[in-house]
Interface confidence: low
């Protein structure tokens, strides 16, 4: 159980106040984290509160400003990047968001040696991506879908690719589907460790069907946004990987890296690229039917100036019970011999664990094991491997950092974080300096987040980087809800849940219940993290009980739970939410006549299906930007879990799992449907089809659209959205305004 320390004493009660919706919308109780921008083993950069860029040396204790806020302001810079030789800084301004990760910006290069901006051969604008080489001060950038290289910031650019075309050919940047569903980055180019080579992806979207939607703006005629977007079963992008020698880029030009034959025999994806040395690179490929992944280690052939990927260096990862990997296929972390590596994949018991691969995957040595999961490998040094897992005390929603000493035999394991601030901190991530000389720990909760700096050898805490003192003081007179994390055992399934309870919770009373659901494959909602958000307000001020439940399909509890939803989305996720609600009713403090469910995106899909389940459990519910049919969603994501929408594959379940098929069942619930019209991710089409089906079935419902808003419903729309949903729930639960 995680109970927030109660600060409510009778004498103080009248000075304490509940959270308000305004607190949430204003971000009054948001927290800060501190991630050092490491530039060596013992130095990092950080942007100070007054916007100076400051270099800190941990060993000397000294700090100095390398770039003043005046210089930053002179070009309205919102971001920066120091060249590895420390001679130049790029300054980023005119940020213009595109999709989830991508944006364009204007870049200025500032010369630290003479304190002036580099003039002559200035960069074009707007640039889609720009980065320094890992050594020196070469620049690679993407402009109008083509890649350019500069040996020095003031030099004229060398154009690497020439075939880039908007919405057709993407060089060095991903197209929509690769950005969102495969790479999860705005870039698709990778420098080799010493900057000798530059690898990049080319995505050909020529044959991909286009999603088109109106952007209303304020002109007389709306604009049409066109995005090549492969929906389930549609034609996919064609990807090719090239590598160019950046020292003599014109000599042989870009060389294509061969695709493994077993992958190339049918539709496939490129999933990631990892440089091992300057002359060895590791590529990961995935069949379109995403249960086979191939990791291919390729070597530079000096004689032919080509990249050779011998079959003996191909490692196959295959799932027989689901898809390959978790959400993504994990990436390798290479050891110092530059051929063996550490990687997380399922062990024979169906738990994701770290394995050491020296020659073949079949001969992999399992490094971690147990009925828990290794989640991320942070760093491998000569003698240590740092990773995170949810092993400690068997709470899947925790994250602790561990160190395995790989230099000694037998290797020993130590939990670095388990007992540091046990009540406050149970969910960590980490950031390591070069050679793991030092590292920062960032604790996200369940208490107020705190970031600390540690010695990489001894694990000693050196200093607190951010402890959110102001937030702690601001919360002193706030009646926060209580939170508990527990589990239900139902039919051999463990359902972990988080319950958020009103401050003066009394088990003998009856409370309205709101289920907040996401429920997507490989997600996790029940986490030991701090948050003061909308549901905190609903519990604190409006007296609701809120519950989050991780059912089948969710992550970090083994493959049996994870892969239970394979080829069957929309069935077990919904069943498990319903099962949990029935268990909550049995606890005796829930008002059975006042139960609601809400979710966003995948959660909107699950909440819609739960409302239309015909159980009579839910009085009302909200779906924000829901998927309504898997035929409308992106190929890469959808097919991973559902296969193809073809007769000889899984078309039947595609058809059976739509929200529209259940239109009749919405008759006895109050349904609020919400969507942004400019949603590039879950297209407005999804809600349009739900609305049409409800109208055709003559079922009453409520709806709200947000003009020109995307999947995030940001800015003023956020305030409107949460205000609107609050009114809807209060009305549903007969709570006075």
């Amino acid at each position: 159980i995680v109970l927030r320390p109660s600060r409510v004493h009778n004498s103080e009660e009248n000075t304490m106040r509940a959270l308000t919706l305004k607190d949430i919308l204003n971000g009054t109780f948001s927290y800060k984290t501190f991630f050092p921008n490491w530039i060596s083993g013992q130095e990092y950069l950080h942007q100070s509160a007054d916007n100076n860029i400051v270099l800190y040396n941990i060993e000397t204790g000294q700090s100095y400003t390398i770039l003043s806020n005046r210089t930053m302001k002179s070009v309205n810079a919102s971001n920066y990047g120091l060249s590895p030789d420390r001679q130049f800084v790029y300054l980023e301004s005119d940020y213009s968001k595109l999709w989830r990760y991508s944006y364009t910006a204007t870049y200025y290069i500032y010369d630290l040696s003479n304190g002036e901006f580099v003039r002559g051969n200035e960069l074009p604008r707007p640039i889609q991506y720009l980065c320094w080489s890992p050594v020196g001060s070469k620049l690679a950038y993407v402009y109008q879908n083509n890649i350019y290289l500069k040996q020095r910031p003031g030099d004229p650019p060398f154009q690497i690719t020439f075939n880039g075309r908007e919405n057709k050919i993407f060089n060095g940047i991903p197209d929509w589907v690769y950005e969102e569903e495969m790479l999860a980055t705005k870039y698709a180019l990778w420098w080799s460790p010493n900057g000798k080579f530059l690898a990049y992806a080319e995505f050909n979207d020529t044959d991909i069907p286009v999603i088109a939607y109106s952007y209303y703006g304020d002109e007389q005629y709306p604009r049409t946004i066109n995005i090549p977007y492969p929906k389930a079963g549609a034609k996919n992008p064609v990807v090719r990987i090239f590598i160019i020698d950046t020292t003599y880029p014109a000599y042989v030009g870009p060389q294509e890296v061969p695709v493994p034959a077993m992958i190339a025999s049918s539709d496939y994806y490129f999933s990631w690229l990892t440089w091992v040395t300057d002359e060895r690179v590791c590529l990961q490929w995935l069949k379109r039917v995403q249960n086979v992944s191939v990791l291919s280690i390729c070597d530079f052939r000096e004689d032919w100036q080509t990249w050779d990927c011998p079959k003996t260096q191909e490692h196959i990862e295959e799932s027989r019970t689901g898809w390959a990997g978790g959400f993504f296929v994990s990436t390798p972390v290479f050891s110092y011999d530059a051929i063996s590596y550490y990687k997380i994949f399922s062990d024979k018991d169906g738990y994701k664990h770290i394995h050491y691969i020296k020659d073949t995957v079949e001969n992999a040595i399992q490094i971690t094991s147990g009925k828990w999961e290794a989640i991320n490998i942070f760093r491998v040094t000569q003698d240590s491997l740092f990773y995170s897992s949810n092993e400690f005390e068997e709470y899947p929603g925790r994250r602790n950092i561990y160190r395995i000493s790989i230099g000694s035999y037998p290797p020993s394991k130590k939990c670095v974080t388990c007992h540091l601030r046990k009540e406050r901190c149970q969910y960590y991530t980490a950031s390591f300096s070069d050679y793991a000389k030092y590292y920062a720990l960032v604790c996200y909760g369940p208490g107020i987040p705190i970031s600390t700096l540690h010695d990489g050898r001894t694990d000693q805490e050196i200093k607190i980087l951010e402890e959110n003192k102001e937030l702690e003081n601001a919360l002193k007179n706030i009646q926060l809800p209580k939170e508990e994390i527990k589990k239900l055992e139902v039919d051999e399934i463990t359902l972990w849940y988080k319950m958020i309870l009103p401050p003066q919770f009394d088990r003998s009373k009856k409370y309205p219940l709101l289920i907040q659901v996401y429920g997507g494959p490989c997600s996790q909602s029940v986490r030991s993290v701090f948050a003061v958000n909308w549901i905190s307000y609903l519990a604190s001020k409006e007296g609701m009980v809120i519950a989050l439940v991780d059912g089948r399909g969710t992550a970090f509890q083994g493959d049996k739970l994870l892969y239970a939803v394979y080829r069957k989305l929309g069935v077990y996720e919904v069943e498990d939410q319903i099962t949990a609600v029935r268990k909550f009713i049995e606890m005796g403090f829930i008002d059975e006549k006042r139960i609601a469910i809400w979710g966003w995106s995948y959660g909107g899909y699950v909440s819609s299906l739960a409302l239309a389940s015909g159980t009579g459990l839910f009085k009302c519910g909200i779906a924000v930007a829901p998927v309504s049919s898997w035929e409308y969603y992106a190929s890469v994501y959808t097919e991973r879990f559902m296969g193809l929408p073809t007769k000889d594959d899984n078309l039947e379940h595609y058809k059976n799992s739509t929200v529209m098929a259940r239109a009749e069942y919405f008759r006895n619930v109050d349904y609020l449907l919400i969507h942004g019209t400019a949603d590039d991710n879950v297209h407005f089409q999804n809600s349009a089809q739900i609305a049409k089906a409800l109208v055709n079935a003559q079922v009453d419902f409520q709806a709200m659209w947000y003009s020109d808003q995307n999947h995030g419903l940001s800015g003023l729309s956020t305030n409107h959205l949460y205000t609107h949903m609050t009114h809807f729930l209060k009305q549903c639960f007969s709570l006075s305004d």
Epitope: V257, P258, A264, D303
Partner: nanobody, 123 residues
Framework: QVQLQESGGGLVEAEGSLRLSCAAS????????LAWFRQAPGKSRELVAA???????YYADSVKGRFTISRDNARNTVYLQTNSLKPEDTAVYYC?????????????????WGQGTQVTVSS
Amino acid sequence: QVQLQESGGGLVEAEGSLRLSCAASGRTFGTYALAWFRQAPGKSRELVAAISSGGSTYYADSVKGRFTISRDNARNTVYLQTNSLKPEDTAVYYCAAKTGSAYYTNRIDWPYWGQGTQVTVSS
């Protein structure tokens, strides 16, 4: 740039064999991926077999186990050994080359082509 010239085609009975050769000009032959395509009358050109610069091979399902592609970088030549020939193997066989990966089945990915050599298999 690379120029390609095929030879070795002809008339052969079913179950017979032929060895097709493709001679290439150009100093950087070893860096090219090479392939054999074929085009039967009224049909589109299809990839039969390909070999990468590193020697990795690819075969169309219809010829697996019967045809073998190989290359001799010293002689600047790529070969296609065709055994157990069937009447449906009758076509003009083309040699093709490209830089980078061999595993592209679409003819538009192969910029360099020979003139072709006729293979006729009689029943």
